[in-house]
């Protein structure tokens, strides 16, 4: 009897949908695996007789519940199927946006770039998929614990009237208000402000 794959799960970030599993202990030799997806009531092969423990399902439609399954094989024997269901638009993890930060005197000027999507045109981003897409920004003075959060209305934001000659750190994430779903934070970007631009009268 061939044991089934273990710890079968979908790892999906920005619609890069990778079905992953672990190979069970099997004394007779090396196992191979076949992964399939349900399409119009028929299971179709996606990865056949692979020695890998993952299979790329990024070409699935973003909408709807998909049934995926994987089994282990050895010679003419095979394990039972292990099934999972997956709805990309609901289940994919929203990866961190890109961010450009520029210091202008005592201000930080930020521009946000929505995450790109696997198997899509360069310009079709997560912002196109989710109508309610917005950004959360948090910033703090480097070396302090107090963080401030803002929700920009656009793809850019300016933090004004900051303390001069002070290092501020900023990070951004995508947020979907209608789903109350937050994405992953970007890596912090830390920049030092320069002088206060106000001119004494």
């Amino acid at each position: 009897m061939v044991p089934p794959p273990e710890n079968v799960r979908m790892n999906s970030v920005n619609f890069k949908n990778i079905l992953q599993w672990e190979s069970p202990a099997f004394a007779k030799g090396n196992l191979t695996f076949t992964a399939q997806y349900l399409s119009y009531r028929i299971f179709q092969d996606k990865c056949m007789n692979t020695t890998l423990t993952e299979c790329d399902f990024s070409s699935l439609s973003k909408y709807g519940d998909h049934t995926l399954r994987v089994r282990a094989e050895f010679a003419d024997e095979h394990s039972d199927w292990v099934n999972i269901t997956f709805c990309p638009v609901d289940d994919t993890i929203i990866g961190p946006p890109g961010m450009q930060v520029e210091v202008l005197a005592d201000s930080l000027h930020m521009r946000f770039l929505a995450p790109k999507i696997e198997n899509e045109y360069e310009t079709w981003t997560m912002k196109n998929v989710y109508n309610s897409w917005t950004y959360n920004v948090q910033y703090w003075k480097n070396g302090t614990d107090e963080k401030f959060q803002i929700t920009p209305q656009y793809d850019f934001e300016v933090l004004r009237n900051l303390e001069p000659w002070t290092t501020y750190c900023v990070q951004v994430r995508g947020f979907l208000p209608d789903r109350n779903k937050a994405g992953e934070w970007s890596e912090p970007v830390c920049e030092q402000t320069t002088h206060d631009e106000t001119v004494p009268s």
């Epitope: 909408y63 310009t123 196109n128 109508n131």
Partner: nanobody, 124 residues
């Protein structure tokens, strides 16, 4: 059942232009995303361009960027693909597709309704 009808294909010399049209028979083309795809002889389906209704944003495959322009005329319920500077490698059957949910642009899996296609041949 939505019926998409493409027209405007034909034979054109390299460097020439064509304008493809996509209309919905008896229906409005009121879908979040309309896309154009193509299939060259012996090859798979390839995304060419799409237009999003909500933002009227347009998106293109690298191979056609700067040469093709997608547009929509809501009053005529028609989406157009203006193809300029045509090359031999643009020879294919061109399909129009409509998406109910508008979540994707390039992947055929994200489209629900398809036309029958129109042949474009670029040859001297």
């Amino acid at each position: 059942e939505v019926q998409l009808v493409e027209s405007g294909g034909g034979l054109v010399q390299p460097g020439g232009s064509l304008r493809l049209s996509c209309a919905a028979s008896g229906n409005s083309l009121d879908y979040p995303t309309i896309g154009w795809f193509r299939q060259a002889p012996g090859k798979g389906l390839e995304g060419v361009s799409c237009i999003s209704a909500s933002e009227a944003s347009t998106h293109y495959a690298d191979a056609v960027k700067g040469r093709f322009t997608i547009s929509r005329d809501n009053s005529k319920n028609t989406v157009y693909l203006q193809m300029n500077s045509l090359r031999a490698e643009d020879t294919a059957v061109y399909y129009c597709a409509a998406s109910l949910w508008g979540l994707g642009c390039k992947s055929e899996a994200d489209y629900d309704y398809w036309g029958q296609g129109t042949q474009v041949t670029v040859s001297s």
